[in-house]
């Protein structure tokens, strides 16, 4: 089982949308795949895929999950808030027929405030 996650870095404006993609591949077929998205180590959602469908479409605050055969799991955050900033990791495990698990690399999401004044203040707070 292989999991590839992207992008490595994502910078978006508050109120817009962010799309994180996880590509899950296995040489043989699987009957049930457990997937998980975490943010800063905390679980956002942990649905499974079987018969081509996700058991859950919601993933964390303002998060929508979708599965596109053959291998793409997409987490869409819309609208993005400042609280969405963080490190996201996608994990997958084949539960049937045989247990095998893998996880992607981190996607770092940075959310810029919609208000340019807030942005200036933030920069001023962290010089260098």
């Amino acid at each position: 089982l292989s999991v590839q996650q992207g992008p490595n870095l994502l910078q978006v404006r508050q109120g817009s949308q962010a799309t994180l993609v996880c590509q899950v591949d296995q040489a043989t077929a699987w009957e049930r795949l457990r997937v998980k998205w975490t943010k800063d180590g905390a679980i956002l959602c942990q649905p499974y895929i079987t018969n081509g469908s996700l058991s859950l479409g919601v993933c964390g605050p303002q998060g929508r999950l979708s599965w596109q055969a053959p291998s793409h799991l997409t987490l869409q955050l819309d609208p993005v808030s400042l609280n969405h900033s963080g490190a996201y990791v996608c994990w997958a495990a084949v539960e049937i027929p045989e247990l095998e698990e893998a996880e992607g690399n981190i996607t770092r999401l940075f959310v810029d405030p919609d208000d340019p004044t807030q942005n200036r203040n933030r920069i001023a707070s962290f010089p260098g």
């Epitope: 292989s2 296995q26 040489a27 043989t28 077929a29 699987w30 018969n51 055969a69 053959p70 027929p97």
Partner: antibody, heavy 120, light 113 residues
Framework: QIQLKESGPTLVKPTQTLTLTCTVS??????????WNWIRQPPGKKLEWMAL???????SYNPSLKSRLTITKDTSKNQVVLTMTNMDPVDTATYYC????????????WGQGTLVTVSS | DIVMTQTPLSLPVTPGEPASISCRSS????????????LNWYLQKPGQSPKLLIY???TRLSGVPDRFSGSGSGTDFTLKISRVEAEDVGDYFC?????????FGDGTRLEIK
Amino acid sequence: QIQLKESGPTLVKPTQTLTLTCTVSGFSITTGGYYWNWIRQPPGKKLEWMALIYTSGRTSYNPSLKSRLTITKDTSKNQVVLTMTNMDPVDTATYYCADMADKGGWFAYWGQGTLVTVSS
Amino acid sequence: DIVMTQTPLSLPVTPGEPASISCRSSQSLFSSNTKRNYLNWYLQKPGQSPKLLIYHASTRLSGVPDRFSGSGSGTDFTLKISRVEAEDVGDYFCQQHYETPLTFGDGTRLEIK
């Protein structure tokens, strides 16, 4: 360019143990998402998948041969090793190693094969 | 185990004529999760290792002549050669990777008349 090369004895006696080595060049067997396989073909017959070892070290065997097989890898030498116990004349075959990726599932690269004859 | 049944076992063809090989599996090789058929076709030329021609039942490997085509889904698959050339002689094998043990068909020997 990835290359696989099988090596081992060309002749073994019945009841003996066969040890075959697959040396991989141009690619590291520690690369994630790859399976390293052994496949054999008796003269004039069909191909038979024998065993695989995954990047993680997980192994899988053909149930018809499982009790006689052990597949391992030596990452320091970039080699995959297959041992087969209690050899019999019906095990006379050309033995191939081949790779397979999670992204695909086909045998992409094959060695040239090594013919092993089992005879007293 | 999934049994792969190939027909015919022998296929004499005149150069320039079409050829067709059938492969049947004892259970479906289609996954509703990935929307893929886990079926590959190989050609083994005399004295050589097998080489991949078609994967996922119908996708031709880059560099394989377009006279080769694969079709089918579920349990019934076909490899077609639109116009056979002398260099196409050899043994053709289908192979499933739906599950382990990975299994091959008995092979079809294509020869030139």
